[in-house]
Structure formats: structure tokens, C-alpha cells
């Protein structure tokens, strides 16, 4: 957990993260693990420590080996240990396995690809992508901040795609490359203003008095994850924690149930020993998304015990 | 000096509800992740609840979510815990105590502990 | 939920001896634990943290071992104010856990 995998080519700069992480105001001190050598804070070294970052600037293949950082608090001090490997540039347009980080999947409506670790160099958009080794050029890549948005994706841009961007240190310039690999999801997710349902619009709900009674709000968002989707109830246009009714209470049912391939959410409203009061309120299921709201109302009404006398007099 | 003070401990009947308070002193309140642990009479050590320094992200132990909430004042270097509708299974010693460490989502050890405020439910 | 089992539950030991505790975890917590006192009465009183260093003001006689899922916490040789009841606990995710203690007594 606390050492870490980092690489990079010679003649890039590198930059890497002490893996055990602290306050800011904690020190980090620096080392080289194998001769507990203290590694410079200086700028003025190639190689040198900056609080939690250690920086190669530029890297250099002798460069590789195991790093120890120690985060000192007042009371504490934490050891960490990052694994560094620093490659030969490729003559070839190949991106070795070793160099690649984690592949990323995208879809017609979430086509982000992230340009790996850019968040700890100091870099100045835009940055530059390439495709098995080619520029990217036509108006479905857009370069946005720190990733790539891929217009209309289709099967045929899954691929290994390369982040290029300067890292910039004091004046100097430090040029560094990341690889990654994009799949493309066949199933397309999508998602829709919500659909209740249950209850119906204006449905009224028999209940007895004394007894205890639940409400299903359903509702169905789309297909694939939601990124926001919720249902809730209200009562008189209140939230339920509001209310301060203790008798009245909400609890997710189903979560995200994937029928049908729709994604659908259930919120039971739990209503124990039913009081008279309680036929006088509003009912709302509530159901929101990114597209909108849905609003269906309940009422309650008193469900008479049969009178078992009645029927025989 | 690190200091912490549990109170509001007591005697309440099952169902019912209490608020215990700690109050710390000698530190960076605002900075640390604080906790509530129990012991219930002659066990072991269940850690209840935490939340992180700015009071952003809240955690719970299976056994009292739902019923616990755990909440701070940084202005007035106080925790608290809400217990609402109590079981007998909640007596215990309850513990407020400080995680000097953590950073957001993850969790170190606790270096200062109260007290202690011992709550029993019972009718 | 990670399980932490400590063994053995009771330690009847004398002073000047040599106390050896076990601390097993249900899968594996990297060096992410730590060991606690706690004497009749008293709030928890934390010895060793990150599995093998002494928390300040730690007498030297206590050490921590281990890795992964076996630990294991040493007192070289017992002071009459070391017998009490010593437990672990992991912090290596949401919930930390605490074993159930092991008793240093007096034999």
C-alpha cells in the first residue's frame, strides 16, 4: 500500500508522489533507499525533493530505483516507498505493457480520457494527443484541461492514446509523455426524464387506522449508471426529515435495479399506526434527475373493517 | 497539553435519547479527524463513529447507523454524538478520541482518549 | 469488515519475563495497525502504531512486528505496571477494528 509503481522515460521529467500521505504542514524528508542518502531539496539538482514530490528533472535510466520518503507530524513519522523505473525511449512507435497506465472505458455519452499523473507537473494547456503514435487532428478531439473529449465515439477509437505536455520549473522546460489504453462500451447507457411507476397520479391509498402502512415510490431514469437520479417523499411540500412526524419514515428500497436493463430506484414510506391525522396529508413521490422532476401525490383514505354482524343481520 | 472531556452520559430507558459532548483543549480542533468509541461493561473496544476534520464526511458502525449521528463545532472545539432510539445493546463507556493523521478517507490511530461518559439503557 | 483475533485471551506471566502477544487479521492490512493499553478504569493508551513503531513515550521494552495479516507485539520483559489488558487494531479502511484484547496477569 505504501510503495508505489512509478516510470517514466529518460530524459523526461518525472515527477513522483510520497504514497503515505499528510497534512500539508507535515515535513517530508527524502531518501535513497538503498544508501539511506538524503536526496537534495536544492532546485539546482537534477534530482531533487520537494516537499511529498520527488522531481527528475530531467530522469536519467541510473535513476531507477527504490525511494524512501519520511512524513514527520509533531508526534509521528510515517514511512513510504516509491519504486521507480526510468525506460530507454523507444526507437519504434510501440508503447510497451510496462509503460502504459490504467486503461479507461468510455461511451457515445462519456468519451473523457484523463492525461495520467498531469496533476503533478506545473503545465500550461493545451496539451497534445496522439493515437497509436499519430496526432489527433479533425473536430471530434477536443483537448480540454487536463483529457481528451472524443465526439461520436465509435468501436474504432478504442486504441492506446499519448498525453505530450511541458512541464515548466523555473524557466526551464521539461517535456513529458503518458500512455494509456481507451476501450469503447458496446452498451450505450441513456438516460431519460424519470418515469414513475407507482404510485399512479392521484392514487388513493386505503389504510386502517391503528395499523401500519407502506408507500412504494418507483421510478426508472434511464439505461446504464446515473450519474444523479433520486426519489424521495414529501408530505405537504416537506421533506420527511423535516416533517417531525418520528411515526413517519423513509427507507431506500431496490437500489439502482437494473430490469430491463432500465435503472430504476424504490423509496418505501414506512408509516407506523396509521392515525387519523395522517389521511389529511399530501403524499408526494418525488422522482429527479439531470432532465427534471416528476411528481406523483398520494392520499390516504380509511379502510373500513368489514363488520363480519353486519353481514349476517 | 491534549486534553478531552467526555459528558452527557446517564441512565435512559430503551427507545430513548442522549447527546454526549466532548470538549478538546491543546490542539488544532479543526485539522484532526475525531472518534467515538464504546466498551461495553467487561468487553472489548467497538469503534462508533467518526468524521473528518472540517466535518465534510461522517462514518458509522453497521450497529448504529441510522440511530447515531455524529456532528462538531469548530468554533467551540466540541464534539458530539446524538444517540437516538437506544437499546440496551448500547451500554457501554463511550470514548471521544483524536486521529492526528488522517487525511481525507483513510484513517490512522488514535493518540488521545477522554475519559470516558458511561450510558446505560435500561428500563 | 475486517476481523482482528488476538491470542492468546489471558497471559499469566511474572515480572522480568518475556511477553509475547499474536494479532491476527481476516486479510491482510499492509502495516496499517496498531497496539493499545488499557489498565481497569482507564481510557486506551496507544503503544505502537504503523505495526512497528513505538508512539512517543513508549518505554523501548515494548516492540511491534509483522505484516499483511500476522502481528505481533513484544514487552522484552514485564514491569508490574505492564500487566493489563493490551489490544490491536487495524485502521486500514472504514470500519477500523479492534481485536478483542489479550489480559497480561500477574502468575
Known amino acids: 500500500k505504501f510503495s508505489k509503481q512509478s516510470w517514466g522515460l529518460e530524459n523526461e521529467a518525472l515527477i513522483v508522489r510520497c504514497p503515505r500521505q499528510g497534512k500539508p504542514s507535515y515535513t517530508v524528508d527524502w531518501y535513497y533507499s538503498q544508501t539511506n542518502k538524503s536526496i537534495p531539496t536544492q532546485e539546482r539538482n537534477r534530482v531533487f525533493a520537494s516537499g511529498q514530490l520527488l522531481k527528475f528533472l530531467p530522469a536519467a535510466v541510473a535513476d531507477s530505483g527504490i525511494y524512501t520518503c519520511i512524513v514527520r507530524s509533531p508526534t509521528f513519522n510515517r514511512t513510504g516507498y516509491a519504486n521507480v523505473t526510468i525506460y530507454k525511449k523507444q526507437s519504434d512507435c510501440n508503447v510497451p505493457d510496462y509503460l502504459m497506465y490504467s486503461t479507461v472505458s468510455g461511451s457515445e455519452k462519456n468519451s473523457k480520457i484523463y492525461c495520467p499523473t498531469i496533476d503533478l507537473y506545473n503545465w500550461t494547456a493545451p496539451l497534445e494527443w496522439f493515437k497509436n503514435c499519430q496526432a489527433l487532428q479533425g473536430s471530434r478531439y477536443r483537448a480540454h484541461k487536463s483529457f481528451l473529449v472524443i465526439d461520436n465515439v465509435m468501436t474504432e477509437d478504442a486504441g492506446d492514446y499519448t498525453c505530450k505536455f511541458i512541464h515548466n520549473e523555473n524557466g526551464a522546460n521539461y517535456s513529458v509523455t503518458a500512455t494509456r489504453s481507451f476501450t469503447v462500451k458496446d452498451e450505450q447507457g441513456f438516460s431519460l426524464f424519470p418515469v414513475i411507476g407507482a404510485p399512479a397520479q392521484n392514487e388513493i391509498k386505503e389504510v386502517e387506522i391503528g395499523k401500519n402502512a407502506n408507500l412504494t415510490c418507483s421510478a426508472c431514469f434511464g439505461k446504464g449508471t446515473q450519474f444523479l437520479a433520486a426519489v424521495l417523499w414529501q408530505l405537504n411540500g416537506t421533506k420527511i426529515t423535516d416533517f417531525g412526524e418520528p411515526r413517519i419514515q423513509q427507507e431506500e428500497g431496490q437500489n439502482q435495479s437494473f430490469s430491463n436493463g432500465l435503472a430504476c430506484l424504490d423509496m418505501v414510506l414506512r408509516i407506523a399506526d396509521v392515525k387519523e391525522e395522517d389521511l389529511l396529508l399530501q403524499y408526494d413521490c418525488l422522482a429527479l434527475n439531470l432532465h427534471g422532476l416528476r411528481r406523483h401525490t398520494v392520499r390516504l383514505s380509511r379502510k373500513n373493517p368489514i363488520d363480519h354482524h353486519s353481514i349476517y343481520c | 497539553e491534549v486534553q478531552l472531556l467526555e459528558s452527557g452520559g446517564g441512565l435512559v430507558q430503551p427507545g430513548g435519547s442522549l447527546r454526549l459532548s466532548c470538549a478538546a483543549s491543546?490542539?488544532?480542533?479543526?485539522?484532526?479527524?475525531m472518534f467515538w468509541v464504546r466498551q461495553a461493561p467487561g468487553k472489548g473496544l467497538e469503534w462508533v463513529s467518526s468524521?473528518?476534520?472540517?466535518?465534510?464526511?461522517?462514518y458509522y458502525a453497521d450497529s448504529v447507523k441510522g440511530r447515531f449521528t455524529i456532528s462538531r463545532d469548530n468554533s467551540k472545539n466540541t464534539l458530539y454524538l446524538q444517540m437516538n432510539s437506544l437499546r440496551a445493546e448500547d451500554t457501554a463507556v463511550y470514548y471521544c478520541a483524536r486521529d492526528p493523521w488522517s487525511t481525507e478517507g483513510s484513517f490512522f490511530v488514535l493518540d488521545y482518549w477522554g475519559q470516558g461518559t458511561l450510558v446505560t439503557v435500561s428500563s | 469488515e475486517i476481523v482482528l483475533t488476538q491470542s492468546p485471551a489471558t497471559l499469566s506471566l511474572s515480572p522480568g519475563e518475556r511477553a509475547t502477544l499474536s494479532c491476527r487479521a481476516s486479510q491482510s492490512v499492509d502495516d496499517d495497525l496498531a497496539w493499545y493499553q488499557q489498565k481497569p478504569g482507564q481510557a486506551p493508551r496507544l503503544l505502537i502504531y504503523?505495526?512497528?513503531n513505538r508512539a512517543t513515550g513508549i518505554p523501548a521494552r515494548f516492540s511491534g512486528s509483522g505484516s499483511g495479516t500476522d502481528f505481533t507485539l513484544t514487552i522484552s520483559s514485564l514491569e508490574p505496571e505492564d500487566f493489563a489488558v493490551y489490544y490491536c487494531q487495524q485502521y486500514i479502511g472504514a470500519p477500523i477494528t479492534f481485536g478483542q484484547g489479550t489480559k497480561v496477569e500477574i502468575k
Open positions: 491543546g490542539f488544532t480542533f479543526s485539522v484532526d479527524s
Open positions: 504503523d505495526a512497528s
Open positions: 468524521i473528518e476534520g472540517n466535518g465534510g464526511a461522517t
